[in-house]
């Protein structure tokens, strides 16, 4: 019989460069069996991660893989910064690698990052 | 339960490859990543290299170039190649699964021994 | 990449006494660190994931602590079947390992 485990799957040091003032969604891929575990996005800050209980937060579906995804209405300066997302699974946490933010303010632009930057999602289906 | 098995002992001669092969079983390989870490012996663990669940990798930089994983799904068994061999080499050679947050190895092989000599 | 210096390299601890191994990052790694034991003639298992989780199994006088660059494995009360070698690992960005320490009954 096959283990089925609840899994994360952001990559190491994984990172987005975004522009403040722009909507962004930030996925964790998640892979379950039955139930769909219950999830949470915490910013990091110092030695703990504090927990965005107040941040709209929405699941897609697709066929393979499941993301939870945190959104920024719009992305303000201070969500610069490293996120991790987390499951809770018959009793267990697992945590993901964090996966960084790094926000431009729009004053300080001197030029928007590209529309390839902008869509790639460099933690797809593995970590 | 979640076995993870190597392919057993080679002797090869500097210069030639060695393909060690890990077959899995308890757990799907396109669910998990593995691993490969090698120890000389009566030394220290050096991770190689892993295969993510989509089959892309990620490999030490001190073995890029001369290191290649793959896996193969439907025979649940991820394979590691070694080119360029040298007697720095001869090690044993471990696959292990990630966790599923992929941020520690929870399960590993028993090994595959390879000595390079001429 | 990031080097993890363990300390010390090797370690003689009387039975129930405490043994407390060291692990130092040359840059932080977050609580990315997972700690190893490796008895003679086998294969790694895990201990500790996350810094300080104590895996699946692993008897609790197994104790994991730290954060950012430096880490802490403590046994707090050694058992024979404890003597083996102890291996650190960050896999905050590609996995590196400790040299290991080798814990031996005096």
């Known amino acids: 019989k096959e283990s089925c485990d609840v899994q994360l799957y952001i990559k190491r040091q994984s990172e987005h460069s975004i522009l403040a003032g722009d909507p962004f969604e930030l996925e964790c891929p998640v892979k379950y069996c039955a139930n769909r575990p219950h999830v949470t996005w915490c910013k990091l800050n110092g030695t703990t991660c504090v927990k965005l209980e107040d941040r709209q937060t929405s699941w897609k579906e697709e066929k393979n893989i499941s993301f939870f995804i945190l959104h920024f209405e719009p992305v303000l300066p201070n969500d610069n910064g490293s996120y991790r997302c987390s499951a809770n699974f018959q009793s267990n946490l697992i945590e993901s690698h964090s996966t960084t933010l790094y926000v431009t303010d729009v004053k300080s632009a001197s030029e928007r990052p590209s529309k390839d930057e902008m869509a790639s999602r460099p933690w797809l289906l593995y970590r | 339960q979640v076995q993870l098995k190597e392919s057993g002992a080679e002797v090869k001669k500097p210069g030639a490859s060695v393909k060690v092969s890990c077959k899995v079983s308890?757990?799907?390989?396109?669910?998990?990543?593995v691993n490969w870490v090698r120890q000389a012996p009566g030394q220290g663990l050096e991770w190689m290299g892993m295969i993510w669940i989509d089959g892309s990798t990620d490999y030490n930089s001190k073995f890029q170039g001369r290191v290649t994983m793959t896996k193969d799904n439907s025979k649940s068994t991820v394979y590691m190649e070694l080119s360029s061999l040298r007697s720095e080499d001869t090690a044993v050679y471990y696959c292990a699964r990630d966790r599923p947050d992929g941020r520690a190895m929870d399960y590993w092989g028993q090994g595959t021994m390879v000595t390079v000599s001429s | 990449s990031i080097v993890m210096t363990q300390s010390p390299d090797s370690l003689a601890v009387s039975l129930g006494e405490r043994a407390t191994i060291n692990c130092k990052a040359s840059q932080s790694v977050s609580n990315d660190v997972a700690w190893y034991q490796q008895k003679p003639g086998q294969s790694p298992k895990l201990l500790i994931y996350y810094a300080s989780n104590r895996y699946t199994g692993v008897p609790d006088r197994f104790t994991g602590s730290g954060y950012g660059t430096d880490f802490t494995l403590t046994i707090s009360s050694l058992q024979a079947e404890d003597v083996a070698v102890y291996f650190c690992?960050?896999?905050?960005?590609?996995?590196?390992f400790g040299g290991g320490t080798k814990l031996e009954i005096k």
């Open positions: 690992q960050q896999d905050y960005s590609s996995p590196t």
């Open positions: 308890g757990f799907s390989l396109t669910g998990y990543g």
